[in-house]
């Protein structure tokens, strides 16, 4: 067909952005292109074309009219991770093609098992006490907090320091005695460790 004067090659006007999404949740990678004739949009992940509902109506990925890629739910197993990776959208018409910036889709995870549960501690009043835990593996890296007797620990108390997985009480009081739980949290949710007992003995 003849080149029409008003026709022009595709250009990407909205590039996809990096995403971190929880497994099972919906997600959208945006892509918008201009061109005349209106360009077709295809998505590629790691160099392989991404199958969508246009290829298989049962697909959990949908190519939206705008050109965006919509995931009905992010699929992510212990081994198979078909949705995680680096994506680009490619807009094409007879005058050429335009490729978007790379966008990484990462899947947030939070495993169940603590790498280290805190242990029971017994100290005398006035002595320091240290409890340590290593939260489950997670992405993003889980933050750590502590609960005492089921309630969040008051880390505004200047005697209490939480650094990494360590809970340090510089000078214990009788009232510090109780059941402590380490809590690992990220966007997926939170996990609680096994209970550790702090016993504070009278001198």
């Amino acid at each position: 067909s003849r080149l029409r004067q008003e026709d022009f090659p595709p250009r990407i006007v909205e590039h996809p952005s990096d995403l971190i999404v929880s497994k099972g949740e919906p997600a959208t990678l945006n892509c918008k292109a201009e061109g005349r004739p209106t360009p077709t949009i295809e998505w590629y992940k790691g160099g392989e074309r991404v199958e969508t509902d246009k290829d298989d109506p049962r697909s959990h990925r949908m190519l939206l009219p705008s050109g965006s890629l919509f995931f009905l739910r992010i699929v992510h197993g212990r081994r198979s991770k078909p949705d995680e990776g680096v994506y680009v959208c490619v807009a094409r018409n007879y005058l050429g093609e335009a490729v978007s910036h790379n966008a990484s889709l990462e899947v947030a995870i939070l495993r169940d098992d603590f790498r280290q549960n805190p242990s029971d501690v017994m100290v005398a009043v006035g002595e320091p006490a240290v409890m340590e835990c290593q939260p489950p593996r997670g992405h993003p890296e889980p933050t750590i907090s502590w609960k005492k007797d089921g309630s969040p620990l008051d880390d505004k108390d200047e005697r209490i320091t939480i650094r990494g997985g360590k809970l340090m009480i510089t000078y214990t009081r009788k009232s510090d005695a109780g059941k402590y739980v380490c809590v690992g949290t990220n966007m997926v949710g939170e996990r609680e460790s096994e209970v550790a007992e702090l016993t504070v003995l009278e001198r």
């Epitope: 790691g46 392989e48 199958e51 197993g77 081994r79 078909p82 949705d83």
Partner: antibody, heavy 118, light 105 residues
Framework: EVQLVQSGAEVKKPGASVKVSCKAS????????MHWVRQAPGQGLEWMGW????????NFPQKFQGRVTMTRDTSITTAYMDLSRLRSDDTAVYYC???????????WGQGTMVTVSS | DIVMTQSPSSLSASVGDRVTITCRAS??????LNWYQQKPGKAPKLLIY???SLQSGVPSRFSGSGSGTDFTLTISSLQPEDFATYYC???????FGGGTKVEIK
């Protein structure tokens, strides 16, 4: 349509090797682990191992280590299973199966009958 | 290795019966348990994944339950097309149960 199509039936002599292929289509080949499972006549299912089509990494149960090789060619979206030093008790239907993101075998090949006989 | 023990190995039932098949793991596998149906000369077909989730396109008369070491597949009202062999599979490290053949009484 998502499917796995396997190579045809084979008849082999004891001591020989067999290579079974599994052509994947309709999905992103490198996104899903591929497993191999076999079934001797009248018997149950036996897992033989997996390959990560993205990296080529493999994992096998102790029973098959040293005798089974799993490879893939991403350019033609095909996985291969090579079993060496064949014995009569290797006579079975060999299946490839895709492991879904839900940790289950959601798509299976049609099976390849391998007969080992002198 | 995690050993999966399925019971019974075979059972006879009539159309309309409620059928229960059990699967026991030799150690805890959380909910990493799947169920498959296999008919003679055919590849297995996924019915239930993650112990209790129904695979797309599978009739709702099939259900799964359990976690840890003990799991159950239930067919609420057996249909003629359900006569087949059923396998459990743990996907924690991957192995299959021995199978349960469901035959016509």
């Amino acid at each position: 349509e998502v499917q796995l199509v396997q190579s045809g039936a084979e008849v082999k002599k004891p001591g020989a090797s067999v290579k079974v292929s599994c052509k994947a289509s309709g999905y992103t080949f490198t996104g899903y682990y591929m497993h191999w499972v076999r079934q001797a006549p009248g018997q149950g299912l036996e897992w033989m191992g997996w390959i990560n089509p993205n990296s080529g990494a493999t994992n096998f149960p102790q029973k098959f280590q040293g005798r089974v090789t799993m490879t893939r060619d991403t350019s033609i979206t095909t996985a291969y299973m090579d079993l060496s030093r064949l014995r009569s008790d290797d006579t079975a239907v060999y299946y490839c199966a895709r492991e879904s993101g839900d940790d289950a075998f959601d798509i299976w090949g049609q099976g390849t009958m391998v007969t080992v006989s002198s | 290795d995690i050993v999966m023990t399925q019971s019974p190995s075979s059972l006879s039932a009539s159309v309309g019966d409620r059928v229960t098949i059990t699967c026991r793991a030799s150690q805890s596998i959380s909910s990493y348990l799947n169920w498959y149906q296999q008919k003679p000369g055919k590849a297995p077909k996924l019915l239930i994944y993650a112990a209790s989730s129904l695979q797309s396109g599978v009739p709702s008369r099939f259900s799964g339950s359990g976690s840890g070491t003990d799991f159950t597949l239930t067919i609420s009202s057996l249909q003629p097309e359900d006569f087949a062999t059923y396998y459990c599979q743990q996907s924690y490290s991957t192995s299959f149960g021995g199978g349960t053949k469901v035959e016509i009484k």
